[in-house]
């Protein structure tokens, strides 16, 4: 089942995607949709990403992270009810059927109407190891038959070490940003 | 306008191969997933086979794999499906279908017959 | 493989009254759902989309809703020539895989 993120009306909303290229410069194209992952593709593509560079995005949404290093988490601008839902990160790699594909649950709450002043906490520098090549379940590390000189390490999400963890209770619980890569 | 039209259809025995042809035009078929989809007489719809815009990557349902080859001419605005080791069950009537996922557009289908 | 189960397989109706259409899959599908409209002796027609986005040329009396495992395609008041078979396809899981139709006739 998909992990559930949160935001508030009006903030930026994080989707964390990762994976590790082989090499600097050997991208793997990704889209990404609104909706679920369907058996092909992205459907209602939002953005998309080639073996170089962003090739195509809508207004409101980017890659605030270095993509070239395997960052494709999605960054929602100044979010809405209406974007609450399901996207899909799909990691496009050469072959038959090899796509990762992740579903990522939005929920977005209501603004606070006067907001208590919770300190961001940069979920980096408090998880420095966020972007080791650690597999967990369905993020195991893939070498791809079809393409040798590349291995793939699809890291989905963070929260897998941090579902049970009181630590993302307390970040949960105090408002703040989970940047869960 | 967008049209597919299909062709090479045709009465053949167990064993045998065909070879259908699917013409497009009304749009820029070199931008689109293809698909082919055949619905056995008096019968519901099967996903056969589809491939990608640059012929990359190509899918087949399991019945037709090592059997069914699909390919692509973007110069020609076509689409192609062999068939070989044609069996009795393979008889329908053969759609090309523009999309990867769901199907926009059909031709309006040839018939490929398989007995003895 | 994704069972896609179409009820009824024959729905009699008459002409101005409402028809609602039932699909199930087996598994769960998310929104990622389409309907057909085929005619005798036609191909079929794309008519929804993503559970409930109707597709060009067909008018607001057909709407889709569901997710999941449960989709119903409405056609709120039937014309003459909304009498056809209807088929819903998933296309969540691998194969991509189309239920077998609801045939609504003219009651």
């Known amino acids: 089942s998909e992990v559930e993120y949160r935001a508030e009306v009006g903030q930026n909303a994080y989707l964390p995607c990762f994976y590790t290229p082989a090499a600097p410069g050997n991208l793997v194209p990704v889209c990404w949709g609104k909706g679920a992952c369907p058996v092909f593709e992205c459907g209602n593509v939002v953005l998309r990403t080639d073996e170089r560079d962003v090739n195509y995005w809508t207004s409101r949404y980017w890659l605030n992270g270095d993509f070239r290093k395997g960052d494709v988490s999605l960054t929602i601008e100044n979010v809405t009810l209406a974007d609450s839902g399901i996207y899909c990160c799909r990691i496009q790699i050469p072959g038959i059927m090899n796509d990762e594909k992740f579903n990522l649950k939005l929920v977005i709450k209501p603004a606070k109407v006067t907001p208590a002043p919770t300190r961001q906490r940069d979920f980096t520098a408090a998880f420095p190891r966020m972007l080791t090549t650690r597999g967990h379940g369905p993020a195991e590390t893939q070498t791809l038959g079809s393409l040798p000189d590349i291995n793939l390490t699809q890291i989905s999400t963070l929260a897998n070490e941090l579902r049970d963890s009181r630590l993302a209770n307390d970040l949960r619980d105090s408002g703040a940003t989970i940047r869960i890569g | 306008e967008v049209q597919l039209v299909e062709s090479g259809g045709d009465l053949v025995q167990p064993g045998g191969s065909l070879r259908l042809s699917c013409a497009a035009s009304g749009f820029t078929f070199s931008t689109y997933w293809m698909t082919w989809v055949r619905q056995a007489p008096g019968r519901g719809l099967e996903w056969v086979a589809n491939?990608?815009?640059?012929?990359?990557?190509?899918y087949y349902v399991d019945s037709v794999k090592g059997r069914f080859t699909l390919s692509r001419d973007d110069a020609k605005n076509s689409l192609y499906l062999q068939m070989n080791s044609l069996r009795a069950e393979d008889t329908a009537v053969y759609y090309c279908a523009r999309g990867s996922n769901w199907f926009d557009y059909w031709g309006q289908g040839t018939l490929v017959t398989v007995s003895s | 493989e994704t069972v896609m189960t179409q009820s009824p397989a024959t729905l009699s109706v008459s002409p101005g009254e409402r028809a609602t259409l039932s699909c199930r899959a087996n598994q769960n599908v998310y929104s990622n759902l389409a309907w057909y409209q085929q005619k005798p002796g036609q191909a079929p027609r794309l008519l929804i989309y993503d559970a409930s986005t109707r597709a060009t040329g067909f008018p607001a009396r057909f709407s889709g809703s569901g997710s999941g495992t449960e989709f119903t395609l409405t056609i709120s008041s039937l014309q003459s020539e909304d009498f056809a078979v209807y088929y819903c396809?998933?296309?969540?899981?691998?194969?991509?895989?189309f239920g077998g139709g609801t045939k609504v006739e003219i009651k």
């Open positions: 491939i990608k815009q640059d012929g990359s990557a190509k």
């Open positions: 396809q998933q296309y969540n899981n691998w194969p991509l895989t």
